[in-house]
């Protein structure tokens, strides 16, 4: 096998099925961020999730090495027709990817959105949102994912995930 | 041009327009996998598809070198809506990315889903599903894509594709 | 910090909010391309967009170094539904990624599509389209993004973007 140089800087962390504790309280530190931060990612599920020269803390990937990172996330929204008064049939499903730097407020890097079907005949909805992009990050920067309608997220490890790798 | 080190480990394989033979029979070896495996990827269409230190066998990308791979696929679902006697055939369009290891059953790495529009006014549907993520793969691991509603897939080379590259 | 070898070849360019001048006229050089080319990308917004060993010219990323590139784009379609008598509200939202080589016509690399909700109850639509893939590019090749229904694009820098990086 050829020598591949220095060890990879990469992570792929996955949803954990238990929905409780998955999301931050609305008044947690990232109150300036839109949506609710996803907190309970899993990072050591054999063959599915890992951390390599990145740390995971409070749902945030913490950068150990400066560079350009391809950052991505997928969130899987799943819901059904439910009898609840005063609820709009339409749902806005938005996934945000933020970074924290030395600046106190989180900085929005990417957002991706879908709205659900408006029809009265709709019985359920399945909507996966994937987005990814390249960003320059510094040591100790932290990146996280937040979502609207967090109670709709399917946190199966194959369905909702978050990752990054150093490019170059 | 600067020296870029060892040769790339990468592939981007594309759909072939002929729909016949595109998908595995439901009773092929991957019967434990959800959906139907896409078999007939094209790997040497100049400027569009290629294999570099990865092999293609029976619709599966075969790993030659251990490491972290960013794996991705896009599948393009396209259909006319048929209203039959006031019934709506809602369609769940799901794309699965699996790996085979030494373990006999395929292991699901990622899944992404969409359902079609519920409105009775709907005439047709266009739904591209893209997903990608980082996974550690070993020599001789094989990865493949399977889908539900396989007859709806547009196998144009720009529309449906599958790829991977070694990160680091 | 470990030595990371040669400088990165990478770019992430982002939408600029002003919609004017954003898209090419339909009779610009890329008339053979489907959709309308997005022209006004921003490449030096601190922490959000950058160019590293790639150039930006007329909305096109210009390749300086031969190799396999992961190319990606996200476009965010957002609109109010207008109820007009006897008109169909359906919209086809398609994102195309093209390359120019020495060949005079642009070559389509990837396309991703969505159609909007057909329901008479629909009030608005939010649809992000992301796609990405690996392609071998040569020095002086140019890549660009074009879209249908360009007037619906939200050109916020977090919502619509275009990027590429050299793999290996």
């Amino acid at each position: 096998v050829r020598e591949r140089g220095p060890q990879r800087v990469a992570a792929h962390i996955t949803g954990t099925r238990g929905r409780s504790n998955t999301l931050s309280s609305p008044n947690s530190k990232n109150e300036k961020a839109l949506g609710r931060k996803i907190n309970s990612w899993e990072s050591s599920r054999s063959g599915h999730s890992f951390l390599s020269n990145l740390h995971l803390r409070n749902g945030e990937l913490v950068i150990q090495e400066k560079g350009f990172y391809y950052i991505y996330s997928q969130t899987y929204f799943r819901f059904q027709e439910e009898i609840k008064e005063n609820t709009k049939n339409d749902k806005q499903m938005v996934q945000y990817i933020y970074k924290y730097t030395s600046y106190p407020d989180p900085i929005l890097l990417m957002k991706s959105a879908r709205n659900s079907c408006w029809s009265k005949d709709a019985e359920y909805g399945l909507y996966s949102i994937y987005q990814g992009g390249l960003f320059e990050l510094k040591k100790d920067d932290r990146i996280f994912v937040s979502v609207t309608n967090e109670h709709l997220i399917d946190m199966d490890h194959e369905a909702s995930f978050f990752g990054a790798f150093l490019v170059g | 041009v600067r020296e870029r080190g060892p040769q790339r480990v990468a592939a981007h394989i594309t759909g072939t327009r002929g729909r016949s033979n595109t998908l595995s029979s439901p009773n092929s070896k991957n019967e434990k996998a959800l959906g139907r495996k896409i078999n007939s990827w094209e790997s040497s269409r100049s400027g569009h598809s290629f294999l570099s230190n990865l092999h293609l066998r029976n619709g599966e990308l075969v790993i030659q070198e251990k490491g972290f791979y960013y794996i991705y696929s896009q599948t393009y679902f396209r259909f006319q809506e048929e209203i039959k006697e006031n019934t709506k055939n809602d369609k769940q369009m799901v794309q699965y990315i699996y790996k085979y290891t030494s373990y006999p059953d395929p292991i699901l790495l990622m899944k992404s889903a969409r359902n079609s529009c519920w409105s009775k006014d709907a005439e047709y549907g266009l739904y591209s599903i893209y997903q990608g993520g980082l996974f550690e793969l070993k020599k001789d691991d094989r990865i493949f894509v399977s889908v539900t509603n396989e007859h709806l897939i547009d196998m144009d080379h720009e529309a449906s594709f599958f790829g991977a590259f070694l990160v680091g | 910090v470990r030595e990371r070898g040669p400088q990165r070849v990478a770019a992430h360019i982002t939408g600029t909010r002003g919609r004017s001048n954003t898209l090419s006229s339909p009779n610009s050089k890329n008339e053979k391309a489907l959709g309308r080319k997005i022209n006004s990308w921003e490449s030096s917004r601190s922490g959000h967009s950058f160019l590293s060993n790639l150039h930006l010219r007329n909305g096109e990323l210009v390749i300086q170094e031969k190799g396999f590139y992961y190319i990606y784009s996200q476009t965010y379609f957002r609109f109010q539904e207008e109820i007009k008598e006897n008109t169909k509200n359906d919209k086809q939202m398609v994102q195309y990624i093209y390359k120019y080589t020495s060949y005079p016509d642009p070559i389509l690399l990837m396309k991703s599509a969505r159609n909007s909700c057909w329901s008479k109850d629909a009030e608005y639509g939010l649809y992000s389209i992301y796609q990405g893939g690996l392609f071998e590019l040569k020095k002086d090749d140019r890549i660009f993004v074009s879209v249908t229904n360009e007037h619906l694009i939200d050109m916020d820098h977090e919502a619509s973007f275009f990027g590429a990086f050299l793999v290996g």
């Epitope: 799943r78 027709e81 009898i83 005949d121 | 769940q92 | -």
Partner: antibody, heavy 115, light 107 residues
Framework: EVQLVESGGGLVQPGGSLRLSCAAS????????MSWVRQAPGKRLEWVAT????????YYPDNLKGRFTISRDNAKNSLYLQMNSLRAEDTAVYYC????????WGQGTLVTVSS | DIQLTQSPSFLSASVGDRVTITCRAS??????LSWLQQKPGKTIKRLIY???TLDSGVPSRFSGSRSGTEYTLTISSLQPEDFATYYC?????????FGGGTKVEIK
């Protein structure tokens, strides 16, 4: 509080017809799909029919298509099941359920098909 | 059509026991499965929907989980009022289908 009350069950001869009703209250009836489910004595639950919230779509199992018709009157908050050409094997307790995922159930109405 | 294979069909248990009922779907149902409880002379009650979401007012001893196409209802500590028949229901596609039922009786 969501309430579903079935009526219209009873004894009917083979080949006969019957119309069941379900009165709904406690929710915006017109927004939700509704279903009929039945259970023959000592048997499992069996889905009979569904009508979508807007009333655009109706669904039946193949074995009941053509004999049974589901309908709704949103102005009256009522769901109906018209059953024709009844057979002995249609004998069951018939339940209405709302919405299409069957969150809420009525108490059922017994239909007996016998000569 | 999607078949739901529910097991066991009969279960004898004591108060305080942990009880597990499984339902295997013949194809992908994307988590659109609920668990119902039926007692003689009572209205059918939904306990869990979307594979793992507890209906309001349902005791926390009931839980639902999923692994691929296999779905599980667990009662962590069986109570006297839990002796009943339990059904799984898939509502991912038509025709809607129910499992065969599991009757939980007192040992």
């Amino acid at each position: 509080e969501v309430q579903l009350v079935e009526s219209g069950g009873g004894l009917v001869q083979p080949g006969g017809s019957l119309r069941l009703s379900c009165a709904a209250s406690g929710f915006t009836f017109s927004n939700y799909g509704m279903s009929w489910v039945r259970q023959a004595p000592g048997k499992r639950l069996e889905w009979v029919a569904t009508i979508s919230g807007g009333g655009s779509y109706t669904y039946y199992p193949d074995n009941l298509k053509g004999r049974f018709t589901i309908s709704r009157d949103n102005a009256k908050n009522s769901l109906y099941l018209q059953m024709n050409s009844l057979r002995a094997e249609d004998t069951a307790v018939y339940y209405c359920a709302a919405p299409t995922a069957m969150d809420y159930w009525g108490q059922g109405t017994l239909v007996t098909v016998s000569s | 059509d999607i078949q739901l294979t529910q097991s066991p069909s009969f279960l004898s248990a004591s108060v305080g026991d942990r009880v597990t009922i499984t339902c295997r779907a013949s194809q992908e149902i994307s988590g659109f499965l609920s668990w119902l409880q039926q007692k003689p002379g009572k209205t059918i009650k939904r306990l869990i929907y979307a594979a793992s979401t507890l209906d309001s007012g349902v005791p926390s001893r009931f839980s639902g989980s999923r692994s691929g196409t296999e779905y599980t209802l667990t009662i962590s500590s069986l109570q006297p009022e839990d002796f009943a028949t339990y059904y799984c229901l898939q509502y991912a596609s038509y025709p809607r289908t129910f499992g065969g039922g599991t009757k939980v009786e007192i040992k």
